[in-house]
C-alpha cells in the first residue's frame, strides 16, 4: 500500500518549485546603489523556499528558467517630484559570480513613481541577483508597494 | 524499471493548477471602491479553474503561493487627465475573512493611464481578493486593457 | 488497479513546460506595426522551448493557458518626448489564424517611456502572437529593456 502510494507521488523538492518573495530592508550607503532585501514569515508575507539571502541579495540554489518580477515605488513622489529630480532607474541583474554579470531588467521612472515588470531568464545555482536603484530618491518600504521575487518555471 | 518510471510521475489533479483570469464587469456604487469582476468562456477569454467569484470578488479554493497579477486602464484618460484627477490608486488585497485582511499590491496612476503589476503571495482557501480603485476616474471595460488574475504556483 | 493508477499519472516531460523569452530583432517596414522578435542561446538570454518563431512572430505549439508578458522601452525618450509623440500604443494579440484574431493586451505610453504587463490567456497550437507598436517612436533593442515571452501554465 505504502509502495503504491509512493508510485503516485513525486517528491515536492524534486519539482524544483523554488520561489521567493522579498520585501525591502534598506538601501545601501552612498556609493552602493543596491537595494537590500529581507524575507520570512515573521516579517509578513515574504518568504524564501529554495533561494537564500546573502547580505540582502538573492542567491539562486537551483538551475533553471525563472520568472523574475519586481515592483519599486518611490517614497516621496508625485508626478512633478519624479521630473524635478535626477533620473531614477532600476536595474535587476546577476551581480555574482562576476563571470556571469549581466543586466536582466531595466526601467526608468520618468514621470511615474512606481515601476513594475517581470521577465523569464535562465539562472544557475550560485547566481546572485542585485537590484540597483540609481537616483536621489528613496524607495518606499511598504510591503505592498516595493517587492522583488523569483519563481522557478522549468529546468 | 517500472518503479523508477513511476517515481517520475505525478497525479495531474494534485498539481493544484488553480488559475483564474477575470475581466471587469462593473464598478461599485458610490461609497464602494471595489471593482466587480466576471469570468467564463462565454464572456471571451476569461476563465476560472478552481477559484470562484463571490459577488464579483475572487475567492480562493486551494491553499498555496499564488502569482497575482492585474492591469487596470482608466477609460477616458490622457496624461493631463490622470494628473488632474490625481490621486487615483489601485490596491489589491485580501478583504475577507476580516482576520486576514491585508493590502497585497498598491499602485498610483500619477501621469499614466494604465497600471500593471504582479506579485507572489501566500493565499489560503476562503481568502477573498478585492481590488479597490480610489479616485474619480472610471476604468475601461475593454478586455485587453483591464484584467485581473491569479495562478497557483506551489503549496 | 495498477492500470487505473497509471491513468492518473503524467510523465514529467509531458507537463507541457513550453516557454519562450524573446528579444527584439527589428521593427517592420513603414505600414507594418509589428515588432519582429528573435530568440536563442547564441543571442544571449533569450530562448524557445516549445514555441517557434515564424518570420519573427511567436507561434504556439501546445494548447493551454499561458502567461504572456512583455516589456517595451522607447529608444530615444524622455517624459516630454513620450507626451509629444503621443499616442504610442503597444498591443499583443493573436494575429493568425485569422479566425482567432483578437487583442489580448494593450497599453499606451502616455508620459512614460516603458510599458510592462502580463496576463493569463488560453492559446491553441498554431496561434501566432503579434506585438503591434503604433506611433512614431522606435523601441530600444537593449535586451534588458525590451523583451516578450510566454510560459505554459496549465492545460
Amino acid at each position: 500500500q505504502r509502495f503504491a502510494q509512493a508510485q503516485q507521488q513525486l517528491p515536492l523538492e524534486s519539482l524544483g518549485w523554488d520561489v521567493a518573495e522579498l520585501q525591502l530592508n534598506h538601501t545601501g550607503p552612498q556609493q552602493d546603489p543596491r537595494l537590500y532585501w529581507q524575507g520570512g514569515p515573521a516579517l509578513g508575507r515574504s518568504f524564501l523556499h529554495g533561494p537564500e539571502l546573502d547580505k540582502g541579495q538573492l542567491r539562486i540554489h537551483r538551475d533553471g528558467i525563472y520568472m523574475v518580477h519586481i515592483q519599486v515605488t518611490l517614497a516621496i513622489c508625485s508626478s512633478t517630484t519624479a521630473s524635478r529630480h535626477h533620473p531614477t532607474t532600476l536595474a535587476v541583474g546577476i551581480c555574482s559570480p562576476a563571470s556571469r554579470s549581466i543586466s536582466l531588467l531595466r526601467l526608468s521612472f520618468h514621470q511615474g513613481c512606481t515601476i513594475a515588470s517581470q521577465r523569464l531568464t535562465p539562472l544557475a545555482r550560485g547566481d546572485t541577483l542585485c537590484t540597483n536603484l540609481t537616483g536621489t530618491l528613496l524607495p518606499s518600504r511598504n510591503t505592498d508597494e516595493t517587492f522583488f521575487g523569483v519563481q522557478w518555471v522549468r529546468p | 524499471q517500472r518503479f523508477a518510471q513511476a517515481q517520475q510521475q505525478l497525479p495531474l489533479e494534485s498539481l493544484g493548477w488553480d488559475v483564474a483570469e477575470l475581466q471587469l464587469n462593473h464598478t461599485g456604487p458610490q461609497q464602494d471602491p471595489r471593482l466587480y469582476w466576471q469570468g467564463g468562456p462565454a464572456l471571451g477569454r476569461s476563465f476560472l479553474h478552481g477559484p470562484e467569484l463571490d459577488k464579483g470578488q475572487l475567492r480562493i479554493h486551494r491553499d498555496g503561493i499564488y502569482m497575482v497579477h492585474i492591469q487596470v486602464t482608466l477609460a477616458i484618460c490622457s496624461s493631463t487627465t490622470a494628473s488632474r484627477h490625481h490621486p487615483t490608486t489601485l490596491a489589491v488585497g485580501i478583504c475577507s475573512p476580516a482576520s486576514r485582511s491585508i493590502s497585497l499590491l498598491r499602485l498610483s496612476f500619477h501621469q499614466g493611464c494604465t497600471i500593471a503589476s504582479q506579485r507572489l503571495t501566500p493565499l489560503a482557501r476562503g481568502d477573498t481578493l478585492c481590488t479597490n480603485l480610489t479616485g474619480t476616474l472610471l476604468p475601461s471595460r475593454n478586455t485587453d486593457e483591464t484584467f485581473f488574475g491569479v495562478q497557483w504556483v506551489r503549496p | 488497479q495498477r492500470f487505473a493508477q497509471a491513468q492518473q499519472q503524467l510523465p514529467l516531460e509531458s507537463l507541457g513546460w513550453d516557454v519562450a523569452e524573446l528579444q527584439l530583432n527589428h521593427t517592420g517596414p513603414q505600414q507594418d506595426p509589428r515588432l519582429y522578435w528573435q530568440g536563442g542561446p547564441a543571442l544571449g538570454r533569450s530562448f524557445l522551448h516549445g514555441p517557434e518563431l515564424d518570420k519573427g512572430q511567436l507561434r504556439i505549439h501546445r494548447d493551454g493557458i499561458y502567461m504572456v508578458h512583455i516589456q517595451v522601452t522607447l529608444a530615444i525618450c524622455s517624459s516630454t518626448t513620450a507626451s509629444r509623440h503621443h499616442p504610442t500604443t503597444l498591443a499583443v494579440g493573436i494575429c493568425s489564424p485569422a479566425s482567432r484574431s483578437i487583442s489580448l493586451l494593450r497599453l499606451s505610453f502616455h508620459q512614460g517611456c516603458t510599458i510592462a504587463s502580463q496576463r493569463l490567456t488560453p492559446l491553441a497550437r498554431g496561434d501566432t502572437l503579434c506585438t503591434n507598436l503604433t506611433g512614431t517612436l522606435l523601441p530600444s533593442r537593449n535586451t534588458d529593456e525590451t523583451f516578450f515571452g510566454v510560459q505554459w501554465v496549465r492545460p
Epitope: 552612498q30 516621496i76 530618491l137 518606499s140 | - | -
Partner: antibody
C-alpha cells in the same frame, strides 16, 4: 507644514565638540534627506552633510574628518557633531530638508548661532 | 568640488526694474541648479529648482534659465519685498556647493 528646530549650546570652547540636534515636527523624518548647512557671520552658505532615516550619510569632503551626522527616527530628530572646533567654525547652523540626496532644500530651520570662543 | 561664482556681488536697483543675476559653475552641472532668497536674520527660501522651475508659491516675476555652466536669475519687475541676498546652489555632485551670494539693494 513641516517645521525644523535646531537646539544646542550657543557657545563651544576651541578644540571641543560642537553638538546640535534638529527636531522635525509636522511630518515624518522617514524617506527625506536631512542636511546641516552653516553660514559664518556676513558670509555665504556651506553644506556640511546629510542623512536619511536609515542612517546613510554623505559629508562635505572638506569637513568629513570632523563631522558625524546621526538620526533617531523614534524621536524624529537628527544630530550634528563637529569635533576639534576653532573660531572658523563660528556660524549660524541650519537644519534643512530635501526630497532627494542631491536636491534643492525646501524646508529650513530658523538657524542657531554657535560661537567658538574661550 | 564644483565652484559656483555669482556676479555681481552687489546690485543696486529700483522698484520696477528688471534685474538679472548670473551664476557660473566651474564644470557642467546640466540643469541641477537652485536659486535662494535670504533676508537678514532669516533662513534662505528656495525660489527656483532645476535651473528654470518655479517653486510653488513663488511669484511669477522670478524666473531662471541656463544649463551647463551658465545660469541666470531674473526678476522681471522688482518689488520692495525683493531686496535681499540671492544664492545659487548646484546639486549635480554629492558635495553640493553654493555661490558666494549677490546682495540686491535699493538704489
Amino acid at each position: 507644514q513641516v517645521q525644523l528646530q535646531e537646539s544646542g549650546p550657543g557657545l563651544v570652547q576651541p578644540s571641543e565638540t560642537l553638538s546640535l540636534t534638529c527636531t522635525v515636527s509636522g511630518g515624518s523624518i522617514s524617506y527625506y534627506y536631512w542636511s546641516w548647512i552653516r553660514q559664518p557671520p556676513g558670509k555665504g552658505l556651506e553644506w556640511i552633510g546629510n542623512i536619511n532615516y536609515m542612517g546613510n550619510t554623505i559629508y562635505n569632503p572638506s569637513l568629513k574628518s570632523r563631522v558625524t551626522i546621526s538620526v533617531d527616527t523614534s524621536k524624529d530628530q537628527f544630530s550634528l557633531k563637529l569635533t576639534s572646533v576653532s573660531a572658523a567654525d563660528t556660524a549660524v547652523y541650519y537644519c534643512v530638508r530635501a526630497e532627494g540626496s542631491l536636491d534643492a532644500f525646501d524646508f529650513w530651520g530658523q538657524g542657531t548661532l554657535v560661537a567658538v570662543s574661550l | 568640488d564644483i565652484q559656483m561664482t555669482q556676479s555681481p556681488s552687489t546690485l543696486s536697483a529700483s522698484v520696477g526694474d528688471r534685474v538679472t543675476i548670473t551664476c557660473r559653475a566651474s564644470q557642467s552641472i546640466s540643469s541641477w541648479l537652485a536659486w535662494y532668497q535670504q533676508k537678514p536674520g532669516k533662513a534662505p527660501k528656495v525660489l527656483i529648482y532645476k535651473a528654470s522651475n518655479l517653486e510653488s508659491g513663488v511669484p511669477s516675476r522670478f524666473s531662471g534659465s541656463g544649463s551647463g555652466t551658465e545660469f541666470t536669475l531674473t526678476i522681471s519687475s522688482l518689488q520692495p519685498d525683493d531686496f535681499a541676498t540671492y544664492y545659487c546652489q548646484q546639486y549635480n555632485s554629492y558635495s553640493c556647493t553654493f555661490g558666494q551670494g549677490t546682495k540686491l539693494e535699493i538704489k
